[in-house]
């Protein structure tokens, strides 16, 4: 009998409000044994896959998706999904990335580091859970 796959989680480091030109890393988490993590942008039509999976805790694995220099076009909704043979998980909640104009001072308020909840996270539409194989679709250069 196939196991029920837990929903992945998504978070962003250092937060979800990022100054223009700064870096952000999306962190997707799922159970041990995930083969591929996918970061989806706005809808399933644009995504990035990675098989670079590592431990997050004794019961969790994670993958990281880094954007080195955030542009205005990177703002939007992101969510994670993973493939653990023989099937894909459902999607995580959406995480909204906000890009702000760089401000001079270091004291400008940012989202807390590692933020993954709050008003910028939206529930996902889990009504459709069939996904293209990891070898198809738009890759990192399209997402980032």
């Amino acid at each position: 009998q196939e196991e029920d796959l837990p929903r992945p989680s998504i978070s962003a480091e250092p937060g979800t409000v990022i100054p223009l030109g700064s870096h952000v890393t999306f962190v997707c988490r799922g159970p041990v044994g995930v083969q591929t993590f996918r970061l989806e942008r706005d809808s399933r039509s644009t995504y990035n896959d990675t098989e670079d999976v590592s431990q997050a805790s004794p019961s969790e694995s994670e993958a990281r998706f880094r954007i080195d220099s955030v542009r205005e076009g990177n703002a939007g909704l992101y969510r994670c999904i993973y493939y653990k043979p023989p099937k894909w998980s459902e999607q995580s909640d959406y995480l909204e990335l906000l890009v702000k104009e760089s401000s001079g001072g270091p004291d400008s308020p940012d989202t807390e580091p590692g933020s993954s909840a709050g008003p910028t996270q939206r529930p996902s539409d889990n009504s459709h859970n069939e996904h293209a194989p990891a070898s198809q679709g738009l890759k990192a250069e399209h997402l980032y």
């Epitope: 041990v32 098989e51 999976v53 590592s54 431990q55 990281r64 653990k84």
Partner: antibody, heavy 119, light 107 residues
């Protein structure tokens, strides 16, 4: 079909240097973590080094026994993995395997290349 | 560093029998454990990952169990090609350590 082909092994004197290469094919190299593992003649397996993908900022990790002497690197455009080995010691004599990660585990192994450190 | 204590170092068995190998981790590793098979002169092959998951193409006579610090690997109905070496490995924390290995011998 996943293929990992190591090269660059050979006989080298103590304190010498050697650079191992691994040509990868049959999978999306740039989205995978890659590893080097070694096995001394008649002995068990020892993890040597790990390099993560660009999405994880090419982070590198090393076994204490090789830290500050070995450097793992990759060329995603050529699907190549490297291990630069400096200040070699007799105890570095081993077969060196190039390994592809999968689910965070060592899913695919090359055939290995033999490094012999001897005066 | 996490030490992996694998036992037995060697074991004799007959064709068709079942054998079990154990691996003890010096601290909890959840299910970040793999089992590999190595034939003489060949590269290791992943058999079990995430403690219990069978790798692609691996026969169902191989199985893994356990979590935390105690893990077992079982081969049921031994075939001639199974009399080789087996290693456990933890992938929970760097350095990624292996057990010392178990050599299966034909009785």
């Amino acid at each position: 079909e996943v293929q990992l082909v190591e090269s660059g092994g050979g006989l080298v004197q103590p304190k010498g240097s050697l650079k191992l290469s691994c040509a990868a094919s049959g999978f999306t190299f740039n989205t995978n973590a890659m590893y080097w593992v070694r096995q001394a003649p008649g002995k068990g397996l020892e993890w040597v080094a790990r390099i993560r993908s660009k999405s994880s900022n090419y982070a590198t990790y090393y076994a204490d026994s090789v830290k500050d002497r070995f450097t793992i690197s990759r060329d995603d455009s050529q699907s190549m993995l490297y291990l630069q080995m400096n200040n070699l010691k007799t105890e570095d004599t081993a077969r060196y395997y190039c390994v592809r990660g999968g689910s965070g585990f060592f899913a695919y192994w090359g055939q290995g290349t033999l490094v012999t450190v001897s005066a | 560093d996490i030490q992996m204590t694998q036992s037995p170092a060697s074991q004799s068995a007959s064709l068709g029998e079942s054998v079990t190998i154990t691996c003890l981790a010096s601290q909890t590793i959840g299910t970040w454990l793999a089992w590999y098979q190595q034939k003489p002169g060949k590269s290791p092959q992943l058999l079990i990952y995430a403690a219990t998951s069978l790798a692609d193409g691996v026969p169902s006579r191989f199985s893994g169990s356990g979590s935390g610090t105690k893990f077992s690997f079982k081969i049921s109905s031994l075939q001639a090609e199974d009399f080789v070496s087996y290693y456990c490995q933890q992938l929970y924390s760097t350095p990624l350590t292996f057990g010392a290995g178990t050599k299966l011998e034909l009785k």
